[in-house]
């Protein structure tokens, strides 16, 4: 049903869904802090622009007794229950921030007449692609897929002179929410990744993964997995690995690789880590002090969601335009705004663009080093280390199929 929005006469409200089921197990208090910090910045920016308006956030909590799994499995109903709560209270803001689970976002988008924008810190799955009023502030699976296809096909780098067309994907079902949807996208037979590869097999058992590491009859030298170094170690341990195996470890929301005192363990030498370029001012900010490196991005996405709303509100108010219109709801895309940690770019479909970074372990220094960067906005790879000190032969990435000549 249509719910009136608290969104006019100089008073603008943001509805923040505080769901028990979340993409990351982050205390709701930390997310509240992030939102409040964002509000302070927005108020300052609006004041500086000569706009004398009130901006507030309403935190909508769900009934933790019913939806208490803590992860995203039971989030579908929780999201709809919260919407029902908003509807009953007749208290909808100009914008909805949250949910972060793909299931709940998909269902909420499907089951509501969305004449208001929805901003999500998460919703990684392909089912949330191309939604007209949904904005996603953490890299969705589609962006990862485009990087992987681009990297697989690349053969014009000093350290990668072969195009690849094959891969194993390790997916055992215990993944975190982001990894679950990333791997789900790679597994899907109709996805861009599957379409562009000649051979792809999903490994679901630990033993399958372990056997491939030394199997002379393997169909690919490349294995994609998602998680942190500890996750890989639990699986691989100190097992021997064939010299032309390349493990791609997707660990986007983890800043720890860039910390000064970090040394790469020996089991990471055959691994390329795909992560996001770290923020520079986050480490000391008040809202992120209590956060682990993996959680910073999640809280930051909430904060940036507030700043995005402030950015759009300022534009519409300066142009004398109405906020409670479909035009406003559809405007949260194809733009760059000033985020907490620098400019944030959203693509034509409202998905955040970012710089992905591929790291390798230097055999000389045992440190993680940047091999290349990838700009998701222009789908382009930029080599950083032209002469990496790889573990692989001739300091070049091997072919994806043993014994195959140049591609």
């Amino acid at each position: 049903s249509q719910v009136s929005q608290n969104c006019h006469n100089g008073s603008y409200e943001i509805s923040v869904l505080m769901m028990g089921n979340s993409a990351f197990a982050e205390p709701l208090k930390n997310l509240e802090d992030a939102v409040n910090e964002g509000l302070e910045i927005v108020r300052g920016r609006l004041q500086n622009a000569g706009l004398n308006v009130t901006v507030n956030a309403t935190f909508m909590y769900s009934d933790g007794l019913i939806h208490n799994s803590g992860d995203c499995r039971s989030s579908t109903c929780e999201g709809l229950d919260l919407l029902r709560k908003i509807s009953n209270a007749q208290r909808m803001g100009c914008v909805l921030i949250g949910p972060s689970c793909t299931y709940s976002t998909f269902q909420m988008y499907l089951d509501t007449e969305l004449s208001y924008p929805m901003i999500s810190a998460g919703s990684f799955g392909l089912s949330c692609d191309y939604k007209e009023t949904l904005t996603r502030l953490m890299s969705p699976a589609r962006k990862l897929m485009y990087f992987l296809v681009n990297f697989w096909k690349t053969n014009d780098l000093p350290f990668k002179t072969y195009s690849w067309s094959t891969s194993y994907v390790y997916k055992n079902g215990t993944e975190t929410e982001d990894c679950f949807w990333y791997l789900n996208a790679l597994e899907a037979s109709v996805s861009y990744f599957s379409h562009e590869l000649g051979f792809k097999v999903v490994l679901r058992q630990d033993k399958e993964f372990q056997d491939i590491l030394m199997d002379h009859n393997r169909k690919s030298n490349v294995i994609i997995m998602c998680g942190g170094p500890e996750f890989l170690y639990k699986l691989k341990g100190d097992r021997a690995v064939a010299e032309d195996i390349v493990i791609i470890l997707v660990d986007l929301f983890n800043d720890q690789y860039f910390e000064d005192n970090v040394t790469a363990p020996d089991y990471m030498k055959n691994v390329l880590v795909l992560t996001l370029s770290p923020g520079n001012s986050l480490l000391n900010s008040s809202f992120s002090r209590n956060l682990s490196p993996t959680k910073r991005d999640f809280a930051l996405a909430y904060l940036n969601g507030i700043l995005l709303f402030g950015h759009m509100l300022k534009i519409f108010l300066e142009n004398g335009e109405n906020i409670t219109t479909p035009k406003f709801a559809h405007a949260f895309r194809n733009l760059t705004f000033e985020g907490y940690d620098g400019p944030v770019t959203l693509d034509d479909w409202g998905d955040v663009d970012s710089t992905m970074v591929l790291l390798y372990t230097s055999v000389d220094t045992k440190k993680y080093k940047v091999l290349l960067t990838y700009d998701t906005h222009v789908n382009k790879t930029y080599p950083v280390d032209m002469s990496p000190t790889f573990t692989w032969k001739n300091s070049k990435l091997p072919n994806d199929i043993t014994g195959r000549g140049p591609q």
Epitope: T154, N155, D156, S163, K380, T381, Y382, V384, D385, M386
Partner: antibody
């Protein structure tokens, strides 16, 4: 406008080293890779290597591995190419060339003639 | 490495007449990762440094007269000059940037008959 200005001509004895500079202006120095290309008298163009001015990492053509060193000084927006153990066959004009889009040479320096003679 | 072969190596032309230079690569220059073909043409006048005329097969650099055009795909490429002028003399090089390392053709010398 984009300009690449190279150091002057050099005459060297066999076995010596030469260091050629290339000063860039008119663009953000660290945002573009730089290549070195040489041309022996009456011969074609030969790619020598590339440097990433942002981090200083390099990659060299097989033929020059061990003899060439490319460096940069971001404070002066200058890249350098040093070639050691010179022999008469290294007599050539050495060019720096900016990479406008990975492996696309859009601007060239005026060239530096290096003569190796005893 | 990709071998680039130009022909002819020498091309005597009459002023005002068309000229055509061919460039063949030992492998396809279609870059799989982005669908582009990175084939450029350079012109070097006597005593000068090379100047890029064409990039990505057929795109003219700014300031390059429209009498120059590039065409081709896969492994076969052509540079055409519709009407040769005096300033067009010199050596023309094709260069590929689709594979590592970048490689040049051996050059085609254009002179007025």
């Amino acid at each position: 406008q984009v300009q690449l200005v190279q150091s002057g001509a050099e005459v060297k004895k066999p076995g010596a080293s030469v260091k050629v500079s290339c000063k860039a202006s008119g663009y953000t120095f660290t945002s573009y890779y730089m290549h070195w290309v040489r041309q022996a008298p009456g011969q074609g163009l030969e790619w020598m290597g590339i440097i990433n001015p942002s981090g200083g990492s390099t990659s060299y053509a097989q033929e020059f591995q061990g003899r060439v060193t490319m460096t940069r000084d971001t404070s002066t927006s200058t890249v350098y190419m040093e070639l050691s153990s010179l022999r008469s066959e290294d007599t050539a004009v050495y060019y720096c060339a900016r990479d406008g889009q990975w492996l696309q040479f859009d601007y060239w320096g005026q060239g530096t003639l290096v003569t190796v003679s005893s | 490495d990709i071998v680039m072969t130009q022909s002819p190596l020498s091309l005597p032309v009459t002023l005002g007449q068309p000229a055509s230079i061919s460039c063949r690569s030992s492998q396809s220059l279609l870059k799989k990762s982005d669908g582009n073909t990175y084939l450029s043409w350079y012109h070097q006048r006597p005593g000068q440094s090379p100047r890029r005329l064409i990039y990505k097969v057929s795109n003219r650099d700014s300031g390059v007269p429209d009498r120059f055009s590039g065409s081709g795909s896969d492994t076969d490429f052509t540079l055409k000059i519709s009407r040769v002028e005096t300033e067009d003399v010199g050596i023309y090089y094709c260069m590929q940037g689709s594979h590592w390392p970048p490689t040049f053709g051996q050059g085609t010398k254009v002179e007025i008959k």
